[in-house]
């Protein structure tokens, strides 16, 4: 038996983090996003649940909806109608999948100071929203869309085809929600509130994933979800637009699919209203390297939507898949014809392009060996976007303004020099025409949210600076965080290293690799975090490293598309390369190296443990994918193609965790999964376990009954992190 080693942070009155701190969320931070209601007015929900109105210019603020009104219906969220006459209050939140939930809605009349009675909304509602003008309501109930011209009016039923687990109107099915739209809704109002566009998803032919939900009853329930795995039948999508002024006169009108898309299996990817009678739809071939953006116009004479061929713009990737994780969406100019869009330039870096007529004639707006990440707002004279250009760090985000009114356009970094040490990772929230905006800084220092003048970029006010958190961290020994790069051959890998307090390079420390590594992800980010790995470094003296290997995002397509059609190879190889480099640094105890990951990270950590290199003593996989055939079609096929003999079946088979079962013999492996995981099905871990048993390989396992992919219920989460901590400490011979 190896003697136990205890890490003792020396000579300091500050205390180390405890696991309890992490599990209690003691050191969580706050952000402040204004809910803009005009150019200079916004709403915000206060700590004590009052809804407060603010006018930046007059400095007025007052409560528009008291917490007692909120409490009277147990409301947790709200939404003001654009005409400001009504507020919906949301209560009985009941989570479904990642974004979707059902809720009960009440409408409050601000003038009368009472709830609207008569024709009350049904419950539970799957989605509800105001029109962009006035106070029309659209909502989805039992997979059908309904419309109310006013909150007190009777509802008008727009669709009748809705059926549980078969046909979804205005809300996505499981796979579209998770892998394509990343929203709980699939309906969009036109800017003037005249038209309502929506998607119908037909899941009638999709195979069902069924799993037990144990609950408290004598018999478990079975959860059934239409879930297309790789190569399976996919949802059939149709897009409709209905005139909400006269919904009973003319029914919903279908928007035609571009010919080059409709010729084989395809996806709808997004919808953007351009003007009151112009809409932009994006489509994607099932083989996701061709995307088509189609601009359609309302033809009053035909009472139809026309999408001329000369308004189709094709985006194609020759080295991988179209877009990043998703295909980017267009940001239209005020002429309602030209638009700005992020896609790969000739060097394979994602940059902003200006499209006036054809994609071929696109004008490149940004360029360089860095990537434009998101276009926030296009106004008459400015375009605001985020990128990782500044100082060449891919894991930073700064906000830039391009003055498009000027010729040539001039570029200014709005955030680069504001709080240089504290803030290197920003997002922003703009008022309608960017007269004002809020900046939300996520780190690396304590997060801070500030309000700015959109003309001068002057800071007007600090909205949230996390003073309480700053005070409570004063007596905590936090680890030191470094973000650096390492080179291997012609490749550069960025890594984040979390070093124990009083780190001494002349000593040896255990190393834990935390990995995600999924295509188009990024783990090495300049953000603030106090989480489980922070505790492991602070209290247990473990060095933590996160490495962004090939396949990760924002470093160009050569790096991103390296993993195309061969998942599970380079992601693992690059983690191993990094570990070898870390050993060369001289402060890592080679006998005590572990790896852990969740989801895609569980897949990579499993394959790394089974790499046969002898680098790892132990590792943990939480909710891992074990075969790409078990995962969702849209995701798996985007990166792997189809699991068919004439496409990529061979690599689908080669890249499973089960194929490497024998190689787990010389490592300590902890396998963890929630039994009610709707996303990465328990099947994945069941198959790993079966393969390990068949190979007579010993391993440890833990399941979490009725927990989903997040294993997020309080008790389960506590148990999970406590269990993983014990496992790691045992592996590293650290006493409890």
């Amino acid at each position: 038996l190896r003697p136990s080693r205890v890490y003792k942070p020396e000579g300091n009155t500050k205390r180390a983090l405890t696991l309890k701190d992490i599990l209690n969320g003691t050191f969580s931070y706050k952000t402040y996003f204004p809910n803009w209601i005009s150019e200079q007015e916004y709403l915000h929900q206060s700590e004590d649940d009052n809804i407060v109105f603010y006018n930046i210019e007059t400095r007025e603020s007052y409560i528009i909806l008291s917490n007692s009104t909120m409490k009277s219906v147990n409301a947790t969220d709200y939404g003001l109608s654009p005409d400001r006459q009504f507020v919906y209050l949301e209560s009985d939140y009941s989570k479904l999948w990642r974004y979707s939930y059902t809720a009960t809605y009440y409408i409050y009349d601000l003038q009368n100071g009472e709830f609207v009675r008569g024709y009350e909304l049904p419950r539970p509602i799957q989605y509800l929203c105001w029109s962009p003008v006035g106070s029309k309501l659209a909502y989805v109930y039992q997979n059908n869309i309904y419309l109310k011209q006013r909150p007190g009016d009777p509802p008008f039923q727009i669709t009748y085809t809705g059926r549980e687990n078969r046909i979804f109107n205005g809300i996505p099915d499981w796979v579209y929600e998770e892998e394509m739209l990343a929203t709980k809704y699939a309906l969009w109002w036109s800017p003037d509130g005249k038209f309502l566009a929506y998607v119908e998803f037909n899941d009638s032919d999709i195979p069902i994933i069924a799993y037990s939900y144990y609950g408290d009853g004598q018999y478990p329930r079975t959860i059934n979800i239409p879930y297309p795995k790789a190569g399976a039948k996919n949802p059939v999508v149709r897009v409709f637009i209905v005139d909400t002024t006269y919904p009973h006169h003319v029914g919903p009108m279908e928007v035609p699919v571009p010919e080059m898309i409709a010729s084989s299996d395809y996806y709808f990817s997004w919808l953007t209203w351009v003007s009151s009678e112009r809409v932009c739809l994006q489509w994607l071939k099932r083989v996701q390297n061709v995307s088509v953006l189609s601009i359609c116009d309302f033809r009053e004479d035909w009472h139809a939507w026309e999408c001329p061929k000369n308004q189709e713009h094709v985006e194609e990737s020759r080295t991988g898949w179209a877009g990043g994780f998703f295909v980017s969406t267009p940001a239209f100019s005020q002429d309602a014809t030209s638009y700005y869009k992020i896609f790969s330039d000739k060097d394979g870096y994602k940059h902003i392009h200006y499209i006036k007529d054809t994609v071929e004639n696109a004008i490149q707006i940004t360029s360089g060996k860095w990537e434009a990440i998101y276009i926030f707002r296009v106004t008459q004279d400015s375009l605001f976007y985020s990128s990782n250009e500044f100082e060449g760090y891919p894991g930073r985000r700064n906000i830039y303004r391009i003055s498009i009114g000027n010729s040539p356009p001039s570029k200014k970094c709005v955030t680069c020099h504001l709080r240089k040490e504290r803030c290197q990772y920003y997002t922003a929230s703009f008022s309608y025409k960017a007269k004002y905006y809020a900046l939300v800084c996520y780190g690396p220092g304590l997060p801070i949210s500030t309000l700015h003048d959109g003309r001068t970029d002057q800071e007007i006010q600090v909205l949230e600076e996390n003073k309480e958190l700053e005070n409570s961290l004063r007596n905590i020994q936090l680890p030191k965080v470094e973000i650096k790069k390492l080179k291997d051959g012609g490749l550069t890998f960025w890594y984040k290293m979390i070093l124990p307090p009083q780190f001494d390079r002349s000593k040896k420390y255990p190393l834990l690799i935390q990995v995600y590594g999924g295509p188009c992800s990024q783990s090495v980010k300049s953000v603030f975090a106090v989480n489980w790995i922070t505790y492991l470094a602070s209290k247990e003296g473990i060095v933590i490293a996160l490495v962004d290997g090939r396949g990760t995002a924002f470093q160009g397509d050569k790096f991103l598309h390296a993993v195309y059609r061969k998942l599970g190879v380079y992601e693992v190889e690059d983690q191993l390369t990094a570990v070898r480099k870390f050993i060369e640094m001289g402060f890592i105890d080679e006998e005590r190296i572990a790896i852990w990951g969740w989801s895609y990270g569980g897949y990579v950590s499993s394959l790394a443990l089974a790499s046969g290199t002898g680098l790892f003593k132990c590792g943990i996989a939480v909710a891992p994918v074990s075969s790409w055939e078990y995962y969702a079609s849209i995701y798996s096929e985007r990166f792997m193609g189809l699991p068919t003999k004439d496409d990529n079946l061979e690599h689908y088979k080669n890249s499973t965790v089960m194929a490497r079962a024998e190689y787990f013999r010389n490592v300590d492996y902890l396998l963890i999964h929630g039994t009610a995981d709707d996303n990465v099905h328990f099947q994945n871990s069941a198959q790993i376990a079966k393969a390990l048993v068949n190979a007579q390989v010993d391993f440890q396992a833990m399941w979490y009954s009725d927990q989903n992919h997040g294993i997020s219920s309080g008790r389960s989460q506590n148990h999970l992190y406590t269990h993983m901590t014990h496992f790691l400490k045992q592996c590293f011979s650290l006493s409890d």
Epitope: S38, Q40, E60, D109
Partner: nanobody, 116 residues
Framework: DVQLVESGGGLVQVGGSLRLSCVAS????????MSWVRQAPGKGLEWVAS????????YYADSVRGRFTISRDNAKNTLYLQMNSLKSEDTAVYYC?????????VNQGTQVTVSS
């Protein structure tokens, strides 16, 4: 001291037109979302129309949409309501309000009477 002075009301035939004005003082008019509201005899306050501070966006009650137009001149600190195709149910005292949201606080107003 905040002051809102409405004018332009009067007696008009069904189908006729009127233009109401509201002159503001004592506050930075150009920074405020402004509204017109009305009170018919024996009824509560009813919202009519609103306009953004920069005049860019306007909202109307269903009962007046297409007939009334709200506008503003920030240089003159004045809010307007152009009322066309007037109906007898438009008879009310009309007030302008600087409250960004209901409930509205109103002053003296201007009487509009639509007779058939």
């Amino acid at each position: 001291d905040v002051q809102l002075v409405e004018s332009g009301g009067g007696l008009v035939q069904v189908g006729g037109s009127l233009r109401l004005s509201c002159v503001a003082s004592g506050f930075t008019f150009s920074s405020y979302y402004m509204s017109w509201v009305r009170q018919a005899p024996g009824k509560g306050l009813e919202w009519v129309a609103s306009i953004y501070a920069d005049g860019d966006m306007t909202y109307y009650a269903d009962s007046v949409r297409g007939r009334f137009t709200i506008s503003r001149d920030n240089a003159k600190n004045t809010l307007y309501l152009q009322m066309n195709s007037l109906k007898s149910e438009d008879t009310a005292v009309y007030y302008c309000a600087k409250d960004p949201l209901p409930p509205y606080h109103v002053n003296q107003g201007t009487q509009v009477t639509v007779s058939s």
